[in-house]
Structure formats: structure tokens, C-alpha cells
């Protein structure tokens, strides 16, 4: 007898996208960085 398959056969893995802005000295512009899965 086999196990009843409770998984769907695949899993969806989500990665976090984190946007951040950083002031650069007196320059009021911003550098936008994109961090994907913990790596900039």
C-alpha cells in the first residue's frame, strides 16, 4: 500500500524583494538598491 500523496508535486518558493533608499552626504538624490534573496 502506498502513502496518500498530500503534496502537490511541486512547491512555490518565494524570494523577498527589498527596496531601500540611502542618502549620500549632502547630495539629496538617492541611490536605489535592490536586494534579492539577501544578496545586493
Amino acid at each position: 500500500d502506498a502513502e496518500f500523496r498530500h503534496d502537490s508535486g511541486y512547491e512555490v518558493h518565494h524570494q523577498k524583494l527589498v527596496f531601500f533608499a540611502e542618502d549620500v552626504g549632502s547630495n539629496k538624490g538617492a541611490i536605489i538598491g535592490l536586494m534579492v534573496g539577501g544578496v545586493v
Epitope: 500500500d1 502513502e3 498530500h6 503534496d7 502537490s8
Partner: antibody, heavy 121, light 112 residues
């Protein structure tokens, strides 16, 4: 609102083939986390699982009835169909279809009202 | 196949008193995903079954908190803390751990 509704003949003759349809609404048969089973219950007796179909069309059958059963689905019509060959009076029962969301709850959470089938000549 | 055995098969209970139904499986119901897929269903007279408890002890939505489930491995219990008139019916344990899926023979709850 999730519903399942069974339909089919009320009376079949011995040796005939029974075809039952389960029409679902409120969820999709293509949902990878869902499956649908057929279960029957002879009058005054316990529940008996018959067959199951997964979203990927994988099928499982009762060991004792496997040779007589076929389960299939039409995703676009939202229907699950069960056929049972060579019907006998002992197959007289209420036939239910039920939904099982996999993992959670991992159990039959929604049932149809059932359809009573009598096998008699 | 896994055989599910329920006891007692019939139990007359006084309204407001507790009730308990046991279910034993012939093999462990622990799935390889570490869940134990043991559920309890209630079937009132003339109605289809209704899910009460899933994965041993989780109450399904809309189920009164007087219903509780416990157990592990092969031994499981459904408890009703205070029986009400609407609880009359047949209670089934079932397993969705292994194919073929199997039910207990049913335990009838009646009022004294």
C-alpha cells in the same frame, strides 16, 4: 461558497454500468492542492471509500473494487465522473463525492448531499 | 490496508454529560511529511458526513469547542465535553495517510 453535487440514475439493473457525476463549484479541479473522492454508504452501514482523483489526473482506487471502477475529471466542466461496471444489488447505496484539500486539512472537508442508487431488476 | 476500529459502537449519554469515542488503527498513521492524517466525521440522521476534527486535534471551522480530539500513532479519541441534543448521530474516524483510504465502522451516539 464551495459545493459538490452528485447526479446519476436512481435505479440500475444488475450487470449494468453505473455512471455518476460530481459537479463542483467554488474551487477548481485544476488546483494543485485539491483532490476529489467518491465514497459510498449502503443503507444503515458504514462509509466506504471508492476512488480518488488528484489535480494532475493521478488516480487511486479501492483495492476490492479496482477492477470495476474508473474515475475521471473534466476540469472545464468542473466535473468528476465515476463509472462502476457489473452492478449488483449489494452495490445499493448512497454515493457521495467529497473534496480533500491536501496537507490542510488533509481530510474531506466538503461533502455533497449524496445520491441514492438502487440496484434491482 | 489500514483497518480502523472504533469503540464503543453505541453509547447512550445523558444530555450535558461528556462522551468519548475511541479509534485504533492497525498501523501508525504518521505520514512521511510528519503529519498524522486522522480525522473525525459526524453524520446526523439523513445527512451527509461533516468534518469535525482533522490531523488528530484540529477543529474544523464552525465546529463547537465542546468537540476535541487527541491521540498519537495508532490510538485516538474524540471527546464531547457536554453532549447536546444536536450531537446525536454516527461518528466516524478515518485515515488519509495511506491508500486505500479507510473509515472506522462508525460509533452511534444516542441520548439516554
Amino acid at each position: 461558497q464551495v459545493t459538490l453535487k452528485e447526479s446519476g440514475p436512481v435505479l440500475v439493473k444488475p450487470t449494468e454500468t453505473l455512471t455518476l457525476t460530481c459537479t463542483v463549484s467554488g474551487f477548481s479541479l485544476s488546483n494543485a492542492r485539491m483532490g476529489v473522492s467518491w465514497i459510498r454508504q449502503p443503507p444503515g452501514k458504514a462509509l466506504e471509500w471508492l476512488a480518488h482523483i488528484f489535480s494532475n489526473d493521478e488516480k487511486s482506487y479501492s483495492t476490492s473494487l479496482k477492477s470495476r471502477l474508473t474515475i475521471s475529471k473534466d476540469t472545464f466542466k468542473s466535473q468528476v465522473v465515476l463509472t462502476m461496471t457489473n452492478m449488483d444489488p449489494v452495490d445499493t447505496a448512497t454515493y457521495y463525492c467529497a473534496r480533500i484539500p491536501l496537507r490542510s486539512p488533509g481530510a474531506f472537508d466538503i461533502w455533497g448531499q449524496g445520491t441514492m442508487v438502487t440496484v434491482s431488476s | 490496508e489500514i483497518v480502523m476500529t472504533q469503540t464503543p459502537l453505541s453509547s447512550p449519554v445523558t444530555l450535558g454529560q461528556p462522551a468519548s469515542i475511541s479509534c485504533r488503527s492497525s498501523q501508525s498513521l504518521v505520514h512521511s511529511d510528519r503529519n498524522t492524517y486522522l480525522s473525525w466525521l459526524q453524520q446526523r440522521p439523513g445527512q451527509p458526513p461533516r468534518l469535525l476534527i482533522y490531523k488528530i486535534s484540529n477543529r474544523f471551522s464552525g465546529v463547537p469547542d465542546r468537540f476535541s480530539g487527541s491521540g498519537a500513532g495508532t490510538d485516538f479519541t474524540l471527546k464531547i465535553s457536554r453532549v447536546e441534543a444536536e450531537d446525536v448521530g454516527v461518528y466516524y474516524c478515518m485515515q488519509t495517510t495511506q491508500l486505500p483510504l479507510t473509515f472506522g465502522q462508525g460509533a452511534r451516539l444516542e441520548i439516554k
